[in-house]
């Protein structure tokens, strides 16, 4: 039998087939060059091998795609379109790549693309229709489940004049191809602010990871229709207080499990709601380990701790009286 | 598929001890609150407590009926929540419902296990 | 603690009818725009089943025909029309603070 039949092992091509194999179409337990094979658990691997474009010749098989910690820069409409389609892929990992570009269509012709995984590329230019394949104001519904966005964004001087905020949100809204989504983790890109309209047209999301990012408000996002959220993961952001509209709508969330750590805290007379929630939610996880970062006064205070005395506000002077 | 199955019911007598034990899989079992929920034979339904889930650190709740008597504790290796009953009472003979918290645990239980007896009687 | 008082204790209707059933909290199960009050179905010999959740909310799985309203402390499970597989006893329940109490349940039985 062949090597790729293997449940414990994985085949291993040799480089010098790369190029002559690579126009033809993939033989049943073919292996491309650089990468490694093994048809018993359905996975292929071409990891850490500075490839500078998806491999043509990837067996029909394939469940499992790891291409990661290569050098893919671009990656075109149709990367993985195939004849015969590889009908069986279900799991792409592209992170660490160094993808800048993924266009229209990048992810079509995968019918069973479940989980994908962009992470750790520095996305300058992140196509709308990356994941919805076409610019129909409703395209197919896209069968990915779960959609892994961290650390992807540029770095400032190789960001388009755009908010990258815009541009990632949207890819995600665009044909409301990603209706099915549910995992989404945005985490390490620098978002300052969370646009209204996108969490709203991904209803069946379970599980946001929006966590060390530089989120401030969280006042105009809304959750109220995310019914089948279960974990929401705003840690290591710049959150200064949550209103009681917002703990209102997490408080009503059926399945919610919601992390605050690490978020500097602005402990004054705007933070009395949320200290009083606090107190008697059971939805915030590690609740006892919020503290306030600011005023300095207060600085490292655990939330918990705090009464209504503790949360004052500085009187405003009238305009008469302030000085410059 | 949930499922949660309660062992370790039987007869004890009054001032006795009894550890019950409850099974759970088809879920992340370290996500979830867990309770203990009893109820006396044609009588109704009694909160007897929970343990709450890893993000807030395992900590308990009882119902007053049973504290200092009663202790909830759980092994997340196992998937198993148990129910240690010390001093026991008469009073405390019940059928002895596992139960799962929903998501939310405000919100209650949403799956419960058949229930396992215990009869204190001398 | 929050006490429920549950009306009718027991009561007999035909099949088809419309069945309401009375919950009252002595205070408010409100916290933060939701009333956490559950409604449970127990069949003799068998475990209770989650019917309603949150006042209103109806269980996945759960016929149409079982509803629930109410909000603060007056609540209602109405069963627009009654089947023999209803025959059963219905607690509600408040978990908006610990100890979480339930009421004293409702038997319903076919005339």
């Known amino acids: 039998s062949s090597p790729t039949s293997s449940a414990s092992s994985f085949s291993s091509s040799a480089p010098f087939l790369a190029s002559a194999v690579s126009a033809q179409p993939p033989l049943p337990d073919q292996c491309p060059a650089l990468c490694e094979c093994s048809e018993a658990a359905r996975t292929v691997k071409c990891v850490n091998r500075n490839l500078t474009e998806v491999p043509t010749d990837l067996p029909a098989y394939v469940r499992n795609l790891f291409l990661t910690g290569n050098q893919l820069a671009v990656l075109p409409a149709g990367a993985f379109a195939r004849r015969p389609p590889l009908a069986e892929l279900a799991a792409l990992n592209l992170s660490g790549s160094r993808l800048d570009e993924v266009r229209a269509g990048a992810f079509e012709h995968l019918p069973s693309l479940r989980q994908l995984d962009l992470s750790h590329n520095p996305l300058a230019d992140l196509s709308p229709f990356a994941f919805s394949g076409s610019n129909a104001s409703v395209s197919a519904p896209s069968p990915l489940v779960e959609l892994i966005l961290n650390h992807i964004v540029p770095p400032e001087d190789e960001r388009q004049n755009r908010s990258f905020e815009g541009m990632v949100v949207a890819a995600l809204l665009a044909g409301r191809a990603l209706q099915g989504l549910r995992r989404l983790e945005l985490a390490s890109n620098h978002f300052l602010y969370l646009p209204r309209d996108v969490l709203a047209q991904l209803p069946s999301l379970r599980h946001l990871d929006l966590s060390n990012n530089s989120l401030v408000s969280l006042t105009y996002v809304s959750f109220r229709n995310l019914t089948h959220l279960e974990s929401l993961h705003l840690e290591d952001n710049a959150l200064k207080v949550l209103h009681n509209g917002t703990l209102a709508e997490l408080q009503g969330l059926p399945h919610i499990r919601v992390f605050l750590d690490n978020n500097p805290w602005v402990c004054d007379c705007h933070m009395a709601d949320m200290v009083t929630w606090l107190k008697e939610t059971e939805v915030v996880q590690g609740k006892d380990r919020l503290t306030c970062a600011y005023p300095e006064k207060m600085r490292n205070r655990v939330l918990l701790e705090l009464n209504s005395a503790d949360l004052d506000c500085d009187p405003i002077l009238p305009p008469s009286l302030q000085t410059s | 598929e949930v499922q949660l199955v309660e062992s370790g019911g039987g007869l004890v007598q009054p001032g006795g001890s009894l550890r019950l034990s409850c099974a759970a899989s088809?879920?992340?079992?370290?996500?979830?609150?867990m309770s203990w929920v009893r109820q006396a034979p044609g009588k109704g339904l009694e909160w007897v407590g929970f343990i709450r889930n890893k993000g807030n650190g395992y900590t308990t709740e009882n119902s007053a009926s049973v504290k200092g008597r009663f202790t909830i504790s759980r092994d997340n290796s196992k998937s198993s929540l148990y129910l240690q009953m010390n001093s026991l009472k008469t009073e405390d003979t019940a059928v002895y419902y596992c139960?799962?918290?929903?998501?939310?645990?405000?919100?209650?239980?949403?799956?419960w296990g058949q229930g396992t007896l215990v009869t204190v009687s001398s | 603690d929050i006490q429920l008082t549950q009306s009718p204790s027991s009561l007999s209707a035909s099949v088809g009818d419309r069945v309401t059933i009375t919950c009252r909290a002595s205070?408010?199960?409100?916290?933060?725009?939701?009333?956490?009050l559950q409604w449970y179905q127990q069949k003799p010999g068998k475990a209770p089943k989650l019917l309603i959740y949150g006042a209103s909310n109806v269980e996945s799985g759960v016929p149409s025909r079982f509803s629930g309203s109410g909000s603060g402390t007056d609540f209602t499970l109405t069963i627009s029309s009654l089947q023999p597989e209803d025959i059963a006893t219905y607690f509600c329940?408040?978990?908006?603070?610990?100890?979480?109490?339930f009421g004293g349940g409702t038997k319903v039985e076919i005339k």
């Open positions: 205070e408010s199960v409100e916290f933060y725009g939701t009333s956490f």
């Open positions: 139960a799962r918290y929903r998501g939310n645990p405000h919100y209650a239980m949403d799956y």
């Open positions: 088809g879920f992340t079992f370290t996500d979830y609150y």
């Open positions: 329940q408040q978990s908006r603070k610990v100890p979480s109490t």
